[in-house]
């Protein structure tokens, strides 16, 4: 049998998060159900983590033997702490669009952990603002962007912008 | 090592113009607010100047606004403050600062470069 | 604009001793979002500014827990518990509610007694 330590060693993590609790859950990608050692976990999950904080968990099955694979995790911030905001000018809004993550509240997590990604189109940009300019009047522009902490997902948002009416004579 | 190193300061005669530079270190440049705060020699620490991670929104207190441009460059890593008609009050030591977003803290700081305005 | 207002300029004191900074504002910095955008900053000699508080009562990381921010609408308070050598320099309140018209209260100078 391999070790646990050796067999979980690239197991990915999906972060959950309870706006009501204002918990995360981490859900373990894995195919077998794991046990968590002091960590309860409930179908692969860790329940009632809070935002910011490390919490270690032992991974074992009975398919691997000791030493346990221990998985720390890197607790995103609070979703509600994001919101995506349109900040496109009145006045450009026939060819532009301006979109951008606003942190509305502080948090504990290192911001340098945080990346952030747009995509609209065909177009992928790694930043927390974007404008783009030069677009046709009047048509619709789709954007999905993702915020990722140590480059685990915790929330995205979509946004459908579409662009004005060109001014009399364009 | 999180770092911002100002750059340009410089002599200048009222009504000359001088460009600031401000290089960015150790950190995701373009996924932080900027600004420009000075302190006269008087030690008062005035906020001369803000932008936005992307560069889209700009905002500059009335002493400066028309005669100052703050920009940046996230390909570069570097943020400018263009200083144009300067003036005597203008004397400083000018310090870019770094500020996560606008309801959040100064939480970095260069250690400064000087501008006087004499002539 | 919003006029931050420190006293005193000048807080003499002995090494060991409580230390007590007040800053008023001109209007309420109470933000419609509910937040009061206060920080306080030192700035030491021959050095940029520092952190200290932020949020009115928030430590930022690394500043020691004798250091502490108090108050509400137009009144605040960094208390400092016991003074020591390295807590000497210039200290400046800052308010962020009114964006983006931030500003700077003055300087309050701690310097031994």
């Known amino acids: 049998k391999p070790t646990c330590d050796e067999k979980y060693a690239n197991i990915t993590v999906d972060y959950l998060y309870n706006k009501e609790t204002k918990l995360f859950t981490a859900k373990l990608n894995v195919n077998e159900k794991v046990e968590c050692g002091n960590n309860t976990c409930t179908n692969n999950e860790v329940h009632n983590l809070t935002e910011c904080k490390n919490a270690s968990v032992s991974i074992s099955h009975n398919s691997c033997t000791a030493p346990d694979k221990t998985l720390i995790l890197d607790v995103p911030p609070g979703v509600e702490k994001f919101q995506l905001h349109d900040c496109t000018q009145v006045e450009k809004a026939d060819t532009t669009i301006c979109l951008k993550w606003k942190n509305i509240e502080t948090f504990t997590c290192d911001t340098q952990n945080i990346t952030y990604r747009f995509q609209c189109g065909n177009m992928i940009f790694d930043n927390k603002e974007i404008k783009l300019e030069n677009l046709e009047p009047e048509h619709e522009y789709k954007c999905d962007s993702e915020i990722l902490y140590n480059n685990h997902k915790f929330t995205n948002a979509s946004k459908i912008i579409k662009t004005d009416f060109g001014s009399p004579g364009e | 090592e999180v770092q911002l190193v100002e750059s340009g300061g410089d002599l200048v005669k009222p009504g000359g113009s001088l460009k600031l530079s401000c290089a960015a270190s150790?950190?995701?440049?373009?996924?932080?607010?900027m600004s420009w705060v000075r302190q006269t020699p008087e030690k008062r620490l005035e906020w001369v100047a803000y932008?936005?991670?992307?560069?889209?929104?700009?905002y500059y207190p009335d002493t400066v606004k028309g005669r100052f441009t703050i920009s940046r460059d996230n390909a570069k890593n570097t943020l400018y403050l263009q200083m144009s008609s300067l003036k005597s009050e203008d004397t400083a030591m000018y310090y870019c600062?770094?500020?996560?977003?606008?309801?959040?803290?100064?939480?970095?700081w260069g250690a400064g470069t000087t501008v006087t305005v004499s002539s | 604009d919003v006029l931050m207002t420190q006293t005193p300029l000048s807080l003499p004191v002995s090494l060991g001793d409580q230390a007590s900074i007040s800053c008023r504002s001109s209007?309420?910095?109470?933000?419609?979002?509910?937040?009061?955008?206060l920080e306080w900053y030192l700035q030491k000699p021959g050095q940029s500014p520092k952190l200290l508080i932020y949020k009115v009562s928030n430590r930022f990381s690394g500043v020691p827990d004798r250091f502490s921010g108090s108050g509400s609408g137009t009144d605040f308070t960094l208390k400092i518990s016991r003074v020591e050598a390295e807590d000497l320099g210039v200290y400046y309140c800052f308010q962020g509610s009114h964006v983006p018209m931030y500003t700077f209260g003055g300087g309050t100078k701690l310097e031994i007694k």
């Open positions: 150790g950190f995701a440049f373009s996924n932080y607010d």
């Open positions: 209007q309420s910095i109470v933000h419609s979002n509910g937040n009061t955008y």
């Open positions: 932008i936005s991670s992307g560069g889209v929104s700009t």
């Open positions: 600062a770094r500020r996560y977003d606008v309801w959040w803290y100064f939480d970095v």
